[in-house]
């Protein structure tokens, strides 16, 4: 079952509420939504020219 704010009055964003594991709270729409997993790559070996950019795992389609 999805859990989220019970009311959406105007643009007053309620505090984030617990979401089910596959979801996270979107401050923009003020609801629990489907979420993918963030993935921060391991740092490159010493001597690497620049830090690895942070990326993410795509959400389930």
């Amino acid at each position: 079952m999805r859990r989220g704010p019970r009311s959406l009055r105007g643009r007053d964003a309620p505090a984030p509420t617990p979401c089910v594991p596959a979801e996270c709270f979107d401050l923009l729409v003020r609801h629990c939504v489907a979420c993918g997993l963030l993935r921060t790559p391991r740092p490159k070996p010493a001597g690497a020219s620049s830090p690895a950019p942070r990326t993410a795992l795509q959400p389930q389609e």
Partner: antibody, heavy 125, light 107 residues
Framework: EVQLVESGGGLVQPGGSLRLSCAAS????????IHWVRQAPGKGLEWVAW????????DYADSVKGRFTISADTSKNTAYLQMNSLRAEDTAVYYC??????????????????WGQGTLVTVSS | DIQMTQSPSSLSASVGDRVTITCRAS??????VAWYQQKPGKAPKLLIY???FLYSGVPSRFSGSGSGTDFTLTISSLQPEDFATYYC?????????FGQGTKVEIK
């Protein structure tokens, strides 16, 4: 393959109406929010409206509030933008876009990752 | 509403240059900022989200940083295909708002 395809644009007189469609494939529009963003000729991007189809929540830019209505039909995997009382300043290319979210400490970290090709709306007499 | 102010509005650069575009929010938006690239007649493309996360498939020469009110998009070595207009956008609060854009032109 994820795809968004807009349709319904065209030439309309001031005060007239149009209904834009955004047909999604490769994902379910129920999973997140769908947005309409417009771009007037030679200008920047302006957000117009969003909907979360699962919850039916919506919001609108002040410039279109009371004139435009965003909706979604999850059975058709399609979002719509009903535009009434159109004005010359509504002339723009209208894009629909999907917002993607990644879980960052329980909160969405995201952006609009897939966009349609755009449909031109011209309001002129 | 939160205003997003980009600078510069346009810049001229050469292939291989390091390019930096800044975006300032009118109030704290944490890290809820995305960057987009748009070419004439095309839809925008997501480059960076949550201020510093590189979107899938985007070349690593693009990077983002910042939090609070000040954000930066950097292209470490400008390539011919990077000449375009770039937009920042906040999604901390509704309505989501875009910066006015920065056009990167060939010098």
């Amino acid at each position: 393959e994820v795809q968004l395809v807009e349709s319904g644009g065209g030439l309309v007189q001031p005060g007239g109406s149009l209904r834009l469609s955004c047909a999604a494939s490769g994902f379910s529009i129920s999973s997140n929010s769908i947005h309409w963003v417009r771009q007037a000729p030679g200008k920047g991007l302006e957000w117009v409206a969003w909907i979360t189809p699962t919850h039916g929540s919506t919001d609108y830019a002040d410039s279109v509030k009371g004139r435009f209505t965003i909706s979604a039909d999850t059975s058709k995997n399609t979002a719509y933008l009903q535009m009434n009382s159109l004005r010359a300043e509504d002339t723009a290319v209208y894009y629909c876009a999907r917002r993607v979210c990644y879980n960052r400490l329980g909160v969405c970290a995201g952006g609009m990752d897939y966009w349609g090709q755009g449909t031109l709306v011209t309001v002129s007499s | 509403d939160i205003q997003m102010t980009q600078s510069p509005s346009s810049l001229s650069a050469s292939v291989g240059d390091r390019v930096t575009i800044t975006c300032r929010a009118s109030q704290d938006v944490s890290t809820a900022v995305a960057w987009y690239q748009q070419k004439p007649g095309k839809a925008p493309k997501l480059l960076i989200y949550s201020a510093s996360f590189l979107y899938s498939g985007v070349p690593s020469r693009f990077s983002g940083s910042g939090s609070g009110t000040d954000f930066t998009l950097t292209i470490s070595s400008l390539q011919p295909e990077d000449f375009a207009t770039y937009y920042c956008q906040q999604s901390h609060n509704t309505p989501p708002t875009f910066g006015q854009g920065t056009k990167v032109e060939i010098k």
